[in-house]
Structures are given as structure tokens and as C-alpha cells.
């Protein structure tokens, strides 16, 4: 058994069930028209 508060996650999507959003580091902010 384990009780953990985890560590900060910066990884992007890896496996099909990772649950992570893509979170691309190169995404640029673009105002909606």
C-alpha cells in the first residue's frame, strides 16, 4: 500500500491511458477572432 502526495508533473501525453492532455510546450497564445 502507499500514501503519496506525488510530485509535480511536466510530462506530455505518453501512453493511451496516461490521462494527460497534450500540453505542448510550444503552443502559442492566439486571440480568438
Amino acid at each position: 500500500s502507499e500514501t503519496t502526495t506525488g510530485t509535480s508533473s511536466n510530462s506530455s501525453q505518453s501512453t493511451s491511458n496516461s490521462g494527460l492532455a497534450p500540453n505542448p510546450t510550444n503552443a502559442t497564445t492566439k486571440a480568438a477572432g
Epitope: 508533473s9 493511451s16 497564445t29
Partner: antibody, heavy 117, light 113 residues
Framework: QVQLQESGPGLVKPSQTLSLTCTVT?????????WSWIRQPPGKGLEWIGY???????RYNPSLKSRVTISRDTSKNQFSLKLSSVTAADTAVYYC??????????WGQGTTVTVSS | DIQMTQSPSSLSASVGDRVTITCRSS????????????LTWYQQKPGKAPKLLIS???TLASGVPSRFSGSGSGTDFTLTISSLQPEDFATYYC?????????FGGGTKLEIK
């Protein structure tokens, strides 16, 4: 079938710490996905609080990061939310949900937390 | 943070009507690596948790009736209900599942006319 169930006190005093637990059945929280907390103030929209991934890593909404801790107890297949220094603005329905790579596909029924003295 | 804007905020319609709800994001949700739009739609009824309807802008979740459809790309998206049924009267939320922090639109409340 995957099911999530929130539990915890329905009333918390201002400045205290809100503590909620989500019990997951039908899937091991260490097998995959992210496990999130989301809240909804009365009559308002949804706000993502943060997640704990199956690996144990966490990520929090920067708007709440200084006050939030999400942890897990793998022996009970539960994950928990702690929100410190609460105010009336933290009054909301709190949901736990499973995150896939594209959506929240399973949700708990929600638990109402009122912050009041 | 990515801002999600839904319109209208409320809408009155009748059973059998065709209804369209729009959602606009402050940043493109199109991921160049897989050419998918990370836009999700949920339905919420009073006192209940949100229910997943559509992911990747247009992929219907399991068990969701085919009268629901999603479209759009980049920053502009729509949810369409082709023929409203009594059980469809609810609040609908869009969400970007692209960049953290994940954010939701303000919701569109669909009411009976």
C-alpha cells in the same frame, strides 16, 4: 463498471482545511489515467482543481496551487483533496473524475461543501 | 490560461427543434502532432454530475444518441442537437483538454420554450 464516490464534511469553517476523499471502484487508480478534482460554486460553472496521475505525479490549477494538495491511498483505491485556508468563495459542489487523454469520462455524483462559521 | 466562451448563455427551444451551441477558445485547440482538436462537450442536469457527450470536438461518447454532433476546428466549435428531445433540456459545457490548467466554458442553459 467504473464508479467514483466523494465523501467528507459538508460544512467547513473559514480559515480551516477542506478535506475530501474519492473512492474508486471498478478500476485501480494505479493502472492508468489521471484522477481529478473539479468544483462548481452554486449556480456557476466548472473549475478544474488538479489531478493525481496513476504514477503518483500531481498537477494543480495555478489559481489554487498554494492551497491544494491531492494525494492517494492505493491500498484503499482512494484519492483525496485538501484545500487549506478556505473562505466562503470555496463553497461549491466538489466532484472527482477520471481523466483520459481527451476528457473526463467518469464522474462522482458530487458532494456539497459549505464554508461558514 | 485558455479562455472558453460559450454562446448563447441560455436558449429556449421546443421539442423537435434543431439547436446549435457555440464555443470559442482564446487559443487554437488543434494539436499539430495528431491533428486532433482537444475540445470536449458535457451535459449537466440539475443536481447531477456532468456527463461526457463528445470528445476531440466530434467523437461521440459511448451511449450518446446520434442526434448529438460536434464540429469545428482551431478556435471555433459547435454542438448541434438535430431534434430536441425532452431529456435534452439541460446545461451544456465545453472544455479545452489541451493545455493545463484545463478550463471550461461558462455553460449554455437549454430551456423549454
Amino acid at each position: 463498471q467504473v464508479q467514483l464516490q466523494e465523501s467528507g464534511p459538508g460544512l467547513v469553517k473559514p480559515s480551516q482545511t477542506l478535506s475530501l476523499t474519492c473512492t474508486v471502484t471498478g478500476y485501480s487508480i494505479t493502472s492508468g489515467y489521471t484522477w481529478s478534482w473539479i468544483r462548481q460554486p452554486p449556480g456557476k460553472g466548472l473549475e478544474w482543481i488538479g489531478y493525481i496521475q496513476y504514477t503518483g505525479s500531481t498537477r494543480y490549477n495555478p489559481s489554487l496551487k498554494s492551497r491544494v494538495t491531492i494525494s492517494r491511498d492505493t491500498s484503499k483505491n482512494q484519492f483525496s483533496l485538501k484545500l487549506s485556508s478556505v473562505t466562503a468563495a470555496d463553497t461549491a459542489v466538489y466532484y472527482c473524475a477520471r481523466g483520459t487523454t481527451a476528457s473526463f469520462d467518469y464522474w462522482g455524483q458530487g458532494t456539497t461543501v459549505t464554508v461558514s462559521s | 490560461d485558455i479562455q472558453m466562451t460559450q454562446s448563447p448563455s441560455s436558449l429556449s427551444a421546443s421539442v423537435g427543434d434543431r439547436v446549435t451551441i457555440t464555443c470559442r477558445s482564446s487559443q487554437s485547440l488543434l494539436y499539430s502532432s495528431d491533428q486532433k482538436n482537444y475540445l470536449t462537450w458535457y451535459q449537466q442536469k440539475p443536481g447531477k454530475a456532468p456527463k461526457l457527450l463528445i470528445s476531440w470536438a466530434s467523437t461521440l461518447a459511448s451511449g450518446v444518441p446520434s442526434r448529438f454532433s460536434g464540429s469545428g476546428s482551431g478556435t471555433d466549435f459547435t454542438l448541434t442537437i438535430s431534434s430536441l428531445q425532452p431529456e435534452d433540456f439541460a446545461t451544456y459545457y465545453c472544455q479545452q483538454y489541451f493545455i493545463y490548467p484545463l478550463t471550461f466554458g461558462g455553460g449554455t442553459k437549454l430551456e423549454i420554450k
